[in-house]
């Protein structure tokens, strides 16, 4: 690596993947193994994140970017950059501090994470129940009873591909 020649900060010419080494007359040195610098002009390289235990490596660390982790099966990511792994529950359950617990009657959870939520009260939005709720599914609301003329058939719409529930970043 060449000695930098900038008249201002000699470190500003050090590219990502290197650091400005004060111990070597501000020469741009490559980041040591298991470290990285994602921007130029850095005076140190950052230690690579290690994906251990319940975390598994989604993307290996390189000299210019940190490792990315996700979670082993049975767990899902929480927080920015998958800072935590949280236990999955089954649909129809919620995770409490005492573990997975079945949703009470009148509530549902269609995800492996999150809370049991009350079924939508269709009448509050001026609609009627087309499909009853279960522990795993919310009710499906349809037109208000007045909107259904005699002989009109009410068709159950297809379930959405994915309900809110947050996939790893």
């Amino acid at each position: 690596f060449e000695r930098t020649r900038s008249l201002q900060d000699p470190c500003s010419n050090c590219p990502a993947g290197t650091f400005c080494d004060n111990n070597r007359n501000q020469i741009c040195s490559p980041c040591p193994p298991n470290s990285f610098s994602s921007a130029g002009g850095q005076r140190t390289c950052d230690i690579c994140r290690q994906c251990k235990g319940v975390f598994r490596t989604r993307k290996e660390c390189s000299s210019t970017s940190n490792a990315e982790c996700d979670c082993t099966p049975g767990f899902h990511c929480l927080g920015a950059g998958c800072s935590m792994c949280e236990q999955d529950c089954k649909q129809g359950q919620e995770l409490t501090k005492k573990g997975c617990k079945d949703c009470c009657f009148g509530t549902f959870n269609d995800q492996k994470r999150g809370i049991c939520r009350p079924w939508t009260n269709c009448s509050l939005d001026g609609k009627s129940v087309l499909v009853n709720g279960t522990k795993e599914r919310d009710v499906v609301c349809g037109p208000s009873p007045a909107d259904l003329s005699p002989g009109a058939s009410s068709v159950t719409p297809p379930a959405p591909a994915r309900e809110p529930g947050h996939s790893p970043q």
């Epitope: 927080g79 409490t96 994915r162």
Partner: antibody, heavy 120, light 106 residues
Framework: QMQLVQSGAEVKKPGASVKVSCKAS????????MHWVRQAPGQGLEWMGW????????NYAQKFQGRVTITRDTSASTAYMELSSLRSEDTAVYYC?????????????WGQGTLVTVSS | SYELTQPPSVSVAPGKTARITCGGN??????VHWYQQKPGQAPVLVIY???DRPSGIPERFSGSNSGNTATLTISRVEAGDEADYYC?????????FGGGTQLTVL
């Protein structure tokens, strides 16, 4: 980056209705429940309800049932909160807030707020 | 319905530690989240799931929760920490906020 941008301030007469919008950007709108929270001048935060942007399913705080309607337009990544039969006590800043990922339901991003003034 | 009780105000000198409490029946069994709100601004999540910090929130902010009390602790308090702080839980069918605590930095 993640943003929730709300519609501008409104002045309404008692008995009227108001509809506040909240446009989301920087994330998948259908992936996170959207909540509405209000704050009267000098008072604390008061939860009003949520909507599931995918299905349109809603849940409202008991206090507002019958007066509030939360809807969404998925094509515009926008949630709406309509409050009817307004009274002076409804003068408040209304916030939309995205539900986060934590156990037990947190609100991780908030709109800038919309001031609704109810005055005759 | 579930209620959360916070002290209306807490005062602390710069550099010291501020503790803001949030009381609720068996709150330790629930997940508690904390928000900071500065005048004229929207709330900001500072602690979630009792003690976890969102990215960008300084390590000086920490939380704990057991029994009937959850606590937000701000160490090495700075003038910029002056704000209202709200605790929040989910209780079976509604989101519940505490009444808020005004933190004054002396």
């Amino acid at each position: 980056q993640m943003q929730l941008v709300q519609s501008g301030a409104e002045v309404k007469k008692p008995g009227a209705s108001v509809k506040v919008s909240c446009k989301a950007s920087g994330y998948r709108f259908g992936g996170y429940y959207m909540h509405w929270v209000r704050q009267a001048p000098g008072q604390g935060l008061e939860w009003m309800g949520w909507i599931n942007p995918n299905s349109g399913g809603t849940n409202y705080a008991q206090k507002f049932q019958g007066r509030v309607t939360i809807t969404r337009d998925t094509s515009a990544s926008t949630a709406y909160m309509e409050l009817s039969s307004l009274r002076s006590e409804d003068t408040a800043v209304y916030y939309c807030a995205r539900e986060g990922e934590a156990v037990g339901l947190d609100l991780d991003y908030w709109g800038q707020g919309t001031l609704v003034t109810v005055s005759s | 319905s579930y209620e959360l009780t916070q002290p209306p105000s807490v005062s602390v000198a710069p550099g010291k530690t501020a503790r803001i409490t949030c009381g609720g029946n068996n709150i330790g069994s629930k997940s508690v989240h904390w928000y900071q709100q500065k005048p004229g601004q929207a709330p900001v999540l500072v602690i979630y799931y009792d003690s976890d910090r969102p990215s960008g929130i300084p390590e000086r902010f920490s939380g704990s929760n057991s029994g009937n009390t959850a606590t937000l602790t701000i160490s090495r308090v700075e003038a910029g920490d002056e704000a209202d702080y709200y605790c929040q839980v989910w209780d079976s069918s509604s989101v519940v906020f505490g009444g808020g605590t005004q933190l004054t930095v002396l």
